[in-house]
């Protein structure tokens, strides 16, 4: 969480941002608050990215001002504009690419006063992975898949009856490059398990940890999935 | 209520140049951007570029450096240029306005003029 | 560039009954989809933005359903005036381009 004054005393207000990830290809949000204001004409809301020459968006007068967006993210973001006058300055961005990463500034001027906030924005690829036990290998087998992942992650196995149990010398984990020729599906397989445990596929980056359970009995599969973003940091 | 009114010649000869010009009334060309949009006879629609009221413009890669899009804020119009016409460039040509910045539907439409290329 | 495909071509529905037009993209467009209606002689009509937002004025018998890369305008109670060409455009990247269209006539 960043929280950031305006300079000029008591002619400050409070803007709060929160460190967030962005899925490559999908649309993301870059979350910013504020101390609102009654009228919406006198707000104003600038986003600026470190490095880039023209503005990320504008917000004023009650609408979007795009004159001095800079081009590499025209069409591509908006605030929600009926959310501004409780204090809402969060930016929806279209199409999240990996050049989207790096610090952004939420500045803000109000009747109140100015401020405003960093946040850090980090871009990659994560999605959930699903175990299934594969019925084709000669050995009882379970396979993890994830299809799309950036920056090549981390694979490792664990299960609640062999706690702590290192499966690198039983599992072989595969990167294949997805035809956008950046992001990768992950497959890791996982052999000789046994009936009635429970296996997890951890897969992890820096931007995301994401797990993938299945409980083997005689009888059933139960399958659980979990995605967590690791840098969801408030400023 | 916002209305759009495209004008210019109806019949352009080829290898020379389509001029076409979209009028808006009813508010103000400032704060959205503009497109044009064509459609062939019997075909489907294709987007040929957009404008916004500051100059900025971005054009469908297909019609590769053949498209010029400007706009007169002064007069609320919007203007096309195509170089180079061929009879593939007979169409329909609507010019449209942007729903909003993110949402990239076109919610205002022209009529539409048919342009043909003949000689 | 992305490529919308819509499926079937032609659609012939009784008048009353739902009509359901699909739309697939070559690559995921997240939520950035709208659908519009064309009558001949006439502009397309937007319908749907975002997947699935009617815009203003639209009836409620139109809905737009889906994400990624499948997307459906289902039309319930067709009315005499519901039967048009109906188009599909993705707005995730440059440049903007549309399906082919699917012509709904009456059975």
């Known amino acids: 969480l960043i929280i950031g004054f305006g300079i000029s005393g008591r002619h400050s207000i409070t803007v709060t941002t929160v460190a967030s990830a962005g899925n490559i290809g999908e649309d993301g949000i870059l979350s910013c608050t504020f101390e609102p204001d009654i009228k919406l004409s006198d707000i104003v809301i600038q986003w600026l990215k470190e490095g880039v020459l023209g503005l990320v968006h504008e917000f004023k007068e009650g609408k979007d001002e795009l004159s001095e967006q800079d081009e590499m993210f025209r069409g591509r973001t908006a605030v929600f504009a009926d959310q501004v006058i409780v204090g809402n300055a969060s930016l929806r961005l279209k199409n999240v690419q990996l050049t989207d990463a790096g610090t952004y500034k939420c500045y803000i001027i109000t009747s109140k006063g100015k401020g405003n906030a960093n946040l850090e924005y980090k871009t990659g690829a994560f999605s959930m992975p699903e175990v299934n036990v594969d019925y084709n290998a000669s050995s009882e087998t379970l396979r993890c898949e994830a299809p799309r992942w950036f920056p090549q992650p981390t694979v490792v196995w664990a299960s609640q009856v062999d706690q702590g149990a290192n499966f690198s010398e039983v599992s072989n984990t595969s990167f294949e490059l997805n035809s956008e020729n950046v992001t990768m599906k992950v497959v890791s397989v996982l052999y000789n398990v046994t009936i009635n445990n429970t296996y997890s596929c951890m897969i992890e980056n820096d931007i995301a940890k994401a797990t993938g359970d299945i409980k083997v009995t005689e009888s059933e599969i139960k399958r659980r999935s979990h995605l967590q973003l690791l840098n969801s940091k408030a400023s | 209520q916002v209305q759009l009114q495209e004008s210019g010649p109806g019949l352009v000869k080829p290898s020379e140049t389509l001029s076409l010009t979209c009028t808006v009334s009813g508010g103000s060309i400032s704060s959205y951007y503009w497109s044009w949009i064509r459609q062939p006879p019997g075909k489907g629609l294709e987007w040929i570029g957009y404008i916004y009221y500051s100059g900025s413009t971005n054009n469908n890669p297909s019609l590769k450096s053949r498209v010029t899009i400007s706009v007169d804020t002064s007069k609320n119009q919007f203007s096309l240029k195509l170089i180079s016409v061929t009879a593939a460039d007979t169409a329909v040509y609507y010019c449209?306005?942007?729903?909003?910045?993110?949402?990239?539907?076109?919610?205002?439409w022209g009529q539409g003029t048919l342009v043909t290329v003949s000689s | 560039e992305i490529v919308m495909t819509q499926s079937p071509a032609t659609l012939s529905v009784s008048p009353g009954e739902r009509a359901t037009l699909s739309c697939r993209a070559s690559q995921s467009v997240s939520s950035n989809l709208a659908w519009y209606q064309q009558k001949p002689g006439q502009a397309p009509r937007l319908l749907i933005y975002g997947a699935s937002t009617r815009a203003t004025g639209i009836p409620a018998r139109f809905s737009g359903s889906g994400s990624g890369t499948e997307f459906t305008l289902t039309i319930r109670s067709l009315q005499s005036e519901d039967f048009a060409v109906y188009y599909c455009?993705?707005?995730?990247?440059?440049?903007?381009?549309f399906g082919g269209g699917t012509k709904l006539e009456i059975k």
């Open positions: 455009q993705q707005y995730h990247n440059w440049p903007l381009t």
């Open positions: 449209a306005r942007v729903y909003n910045n993110y949402d990239w539907g076109f919610d205002y």
